[in-house]
C-alpha cells in the first residue's frame, strides 16, 4: 500500500507568492510559493495519486502583515481552502496567547490540529478540551493512518502560551500515544511536529512504532540530487534514521516559507512496516501557475492589508535617527528603539530566579534603512517601519558563549569608519571601543545586563558563560561577516517578524522618545 505525504512547515504567513529569498514579491515572473500556487500543485498530485495526505508541521503564524492584520483567521481560511488533512502546533501559534490560537484557528480549522506533549491545566483544560488533539486517525483510501503531533518544549521561552499549558518532553509524551494507536490496531503512524531536525531524528530513533517523522522549526532543507534553488541541503531527502529497534525511519522537513512542497512516497507492507520511501521537496516556482480561484480570494483579503499599512500605530516626539551616518558609526536612537522593542517582545517571566530569560540585543546598523521624521505630527505607520526594516527578517533568540560575543563586537569595529553595515547597535549591553588599538583588540569594556537578578545591573561579560541574545536572523545566519555567530551559536530559535516586533512595541507605548544614552562609547 502506497501513501503520498505532502508537507509544509514554517510557512510563516507567506500567503502571497514571494521572491526567491522569501521576501516580498517584486518581479512576479520570478516569484515562488504562496497558497494559490501550492494549491495548484497539491490538486495536481491529488488527481494523479490515490492515497494523499497534506500535512503542516507548524508555525503558520507570524511573519508578514497578513498575520499582523488577520491574526490567524487567514491561516484557518486558506488551510481549509487547501483541504489540509492535519497540522501540528508550532511555537509561533502561541504568539498571540492561547486565546489568539483558540478563536481564530482551533475553532475554525476543518482539519485536526495536533500536539501530544502539550497538556492543559486549570481553567484552560475544559475551555481547550477537544480543540487540539494528541493524535488523529485519518481514513486514507481503504486504510487508516495515525498522525501524532508534538511541539517544541521550549515554547514558553519562544512565545506566549501562558501558565496553564505544560510542555512535556516530546519523546516521553509521544510514546504512550503511539502505544495507544498500536493497541487500536493502527499500524501506520506518522509523527508530525515542530521541535527541529535534531529532535525529529531522536523521535525517529527512540519512539517505538513511529513509521515516518514529518518535522519543522529548524527550517531544514533536505534534498536528493541537485538542489533546484539557493538552499543548501543538510542531508538527503528523506533522511533515514535507524531506530533503536532496528527499523529504517524516514525523516523529512521542507525548508520554510512555503517555497517548497515536501513530497514523500512511502510503501507499507500489509503489517504496516515501511518497505520503501523516496521523494524530494518540489520547488514552487513560476512554472507552476497560481490557482485562479485561490488567487482571487487572496486579492479579496489583500484589500484590508493595504488600508492597515497607512494607519497610525503610535507617535514619536523625537526624530528617529535611522540614518547610515549615525547607525553605522555610533549609537543611534533608532537602533536603541529597535533593540528595546526586541527585548520587550521577549519578556517571559518563567522562573522566579530570573527577571527575564534574556536581556541582550544586538542589531547590525546596516539593517536600519531609514529614519522617521517626527515632524509629520509624530505619526508612525507600518509603511514607515517597512522603510526602516524592508528585508522581511525576524528577530531571533540565540545562545552564545561570551567569547563569541566578544568576537562579534571586535568584528563590529574591525574596519570602522567606512560606513559598513556590521557596526552593532545594542540593548542590555554597554560597550567601550578604543579605535587607536589594532583591529581585533578594540573592545576595552563589555558589560552586560544580568538576568538572574531582582535588580538588573551591568556586569562584565564572562568569556565562558552562555548568554541568550536577541538578534536579527541575518546575523544568526552569519550575515555582514558575523561568521563567528553562525559557527559558534549553541542554539537558534526563529523569532517574530521584525516590523511586527517594533510596531507592537510602538502601539503598546503609544508615545515614544528614544534617546542616545551611552550604550556605545569610544575611549
Amino acid at each position: 500500500w502506497e501513501l503520498t505525504i505532502l508537507h509544509t512547515n514554517d510557512v510563516h504567513s507567506r500567503l502571497e507568492q514571494t521572491s526567491e529569498d522569501s521576501s516580498k514579491c517584486v518581479n512576479a515572473s520570478r516569484c515562488m510559493g504562496g497558497v494559490a500556487r501550492l494549491f495548484t500543485k497539491v490538486q495536481q498530485i491529488r488527481r494523479a495519486e490515490p492515497n494523499v495526505l497534506l500535512l503542516d508541521a507548524g508555525d503558520q503564524y507570524q511573519g508578514t502583515i497578513w498575520f499582523t492584520v488577520y491574526k490567524g483567521a487567514e491561516v484557518a481560511h486558506f488551510m481549509n481552502a487547501l483541504r489540509y488533512d492535519a497540522m501540528a502546533l508550532g511555537n509561533h501559534e502561541f504568539d498571540n496567547g492561547v486565546e489568539g490560537l483558540i478563536e481564530p484557528l482551533l475553532k475554525e480549522a476543518k482539519f485536526p490540529i495536533l500536539s501530544a506533549n502539550i497538556k492543559a491545566k486549570g481553567p484552560l483544560a475544559s475551555q481547550i478540551s477537544g480543540l487540539y488533539l494528541p493524535y488523529k486517525v485519518l481514513p486514507v483510501g481503504d486504510e487508516v493512518v495515525g498522525i501524532v503531533g508534538y511541539t517544541s518544549k521550549e515554547t514558553p521561552f519562544l512565545s506566549n502560551p501562558g501558565t496553564n499549558l505544560v510542555f512535556e518532553d516530546e519523546i516521553t509524551a509521544l510514546q504512550p500515544e503511539v502505544d495507544k494507536l498500536k493497541t487500536l490496531n493502527v499500524n501506520k503512524i506518522i509523527a508530525l511536529g515542530h521541535s527541529g531536525f535534531e529532535m525529529d531524528k531522536l523521535i525517529a530513533q527512540k519512539v517505538r512504532g513511529v513509521d515516518v517523522v514529518v518535522g519543522g522549526h529548524s527550517n531544514t532543507f533536505l534534498y536528493t540530487g541537485n538542489p533546484p534553488s539557493k538552499e543548501v541541503p543538510a542531508g538527503k531527502y528523506p533522511f533515514i534514521v535507524t531506530s533503536d529497534d532496528g527499523r529504517k525511519v524516514p525523516v523529512v522537513q521542507a525548508y520554510a516559507f512555503g517555497k517548497y512542497l515536501g513530497y514523500l512516497k512511502i510503501e507499507f507492507d500489509e503489517r504496516g512496516n515501511v518497505i520503501s520511501s523516496h521523494g524530494n521537496p518540489i520547488l514552487l516556482n513560476s512554472s507552476i501557475p497560481e490557482d485562479p480561484s485561490i488567487k482571487a480570494d487572496i486579492n479579496k483579503w489583500r484589500i484590508k492589508l493595504d488600508n492597515y499599512s497607512t494607519q497610525e500605530l503610535g507617535k514619536t516626539i523625537v526624530y528617529l535617527d535611522g540614518s547610515s551616518q549615525s547607525c553605522r558609526f555610533r549609537e543611534c536612537n533608532m537602533g536603541n528603539l529597535i533593540c528595546d522593542a526586541m527585548i520587550n517582545n521577549n519578556l517571559r517571566h518563567t522562573d522566579e530566579m530570573f527577571w527575564n530569560h534574556v536581556s541582550m540585543c544586538i542589531l547590525n546598523g546596516g539593517g536600519i534603512r531609514s529614519p522617521i521624521d517626527e515632524r509629520n505630527n509624530g505619526t508612525i505607520t507600518w509603511e514607515n517601519l517597512a522603510a526602516v526594516l524592508p528585508f522581511g527578517g525576524t528577530f531571533d533568540l540565540v545562545q552564545l558563549k561570551g567569547s563569541t560575543l566578544k568576537k562579534a563586537f571586535e568584528h563590529s569595529v574591525h574596519r570602522y569608519g567606512q560606513s559598513t553595515g556590521e557596526f552593532l547597535q545594542v540593548g542590555g549591553i554597554h560597550v567601550v571601543y578604543d579605535l587607536s588599538r589594532k583591529p581585533g583588540d578594540r573592545v576595552v569594556k563589555l558589560d552586560v545586563l544580568c538576568t538572574k537578578c531582582r535588580v538588573p545591573s551591568y556586569d562584565p561579560l564572562k568569556m565562558d558563560e552562555v548568554y541568550k541574545v536577541i538578534l536579527p536572523n541575518f546575523l544568526a545566519n552569519g550575515g555582514d561577516g558575523f561568521q563567528m555567530i553562525k559557527d559558534e551559536l549553541l542554539r537558534h530559535d526563529s523569532g517574530d517578524q521584525d516590523i511586527n516586533v517594533v510596531s507592537t512595541y510602538i502601539s503598546k507605548m503609544k508615545v515614544i522618545y528614544p534617546a542616545v544614552e551611552g550604550r556605545i562609547k569610544f575611549s
Epitope: D85, K110, P112, K136, V137, L184
Partner: nanobody
C-alpha cells in the same frame, strides 16, 4: 478485519419507534467515539447522535433531541440508537461510524474531521 454492521432499519409509520444496532467486529468499541449519521436522498450526510467511549458523554442534533437516545453496551461491543416519535423527514440511510481519536462527541457528529471507520448503512423509511 474491522467491521461495523448496522441493523434494525425498516418501514415504520409516523409516530412509531425503531431501535438501530451497530455491532463492531475486529475492534473494541470501549475506546472509540461512536456516531450515528444519516443521509436522505439528494441530501448531505448529517450527524444524528454521538457517544464517547470514556465518559459516555452524548451529543444530539437539534432535529432529534428528545426523540432519539444513543446508548452503548460495551460487553456486547454494540451501540444502539433508540428512535421514537418518528417523522417522514427521518427517512434516510442510517450509518454507524467510529473514531479512536480523542475527539469530542460534538466534533465527531458535526463531523468536524474525517471519520476513519464506517458501516454499510441501514435504511429507515417513515411512511403511512
Amino acid at each position: 478485519q474491522r467491521q461495523l454492521v448496522e441493523s434494525g432499519g425498516g418501514l415504520v409509520q409516523p409516530g412509531g419507534s425503531l431501535r438501530l444496532s451497530c455491532a463492531a467486529s475486529g475492534f473494541l468499541l470501549d475506546y472509540y467515539v461512536i456516531g450515528w449519521f444519516r443521509q436522505a436522498p439528494g441530501k448531505e450526510r448529517e450527524g444524528v447522535s454521538c457517544i464517547s467511549g470514556s465518559d459516555r458523554s452524548t451529543y444530539y442534533a437539534d432535529s432529534v433531541k428528545g426523540r432519539f437516545t444513543i446508548s452503548r453496551d460495551n460487553s456486547k461491543n454494540t451501540v444502539y440508537l433508540q428512535m421514537s416519535s418518528l417523522r417522514a423527514e427521518d427517512t434516510a440511510v442510517y450509518y454507524c461510524a467510529a473514531d479512536p481519536s480523542p475527539v469530542t462527541v460534538q466534533a465527531m457528529c458535526l463531523p468536524r474531521f474525517p471519520v476513519p471507520y464506517w458501516g454499510q448503512g441501514t435504511l429507515v423509511t417513515v411512511s403511512s
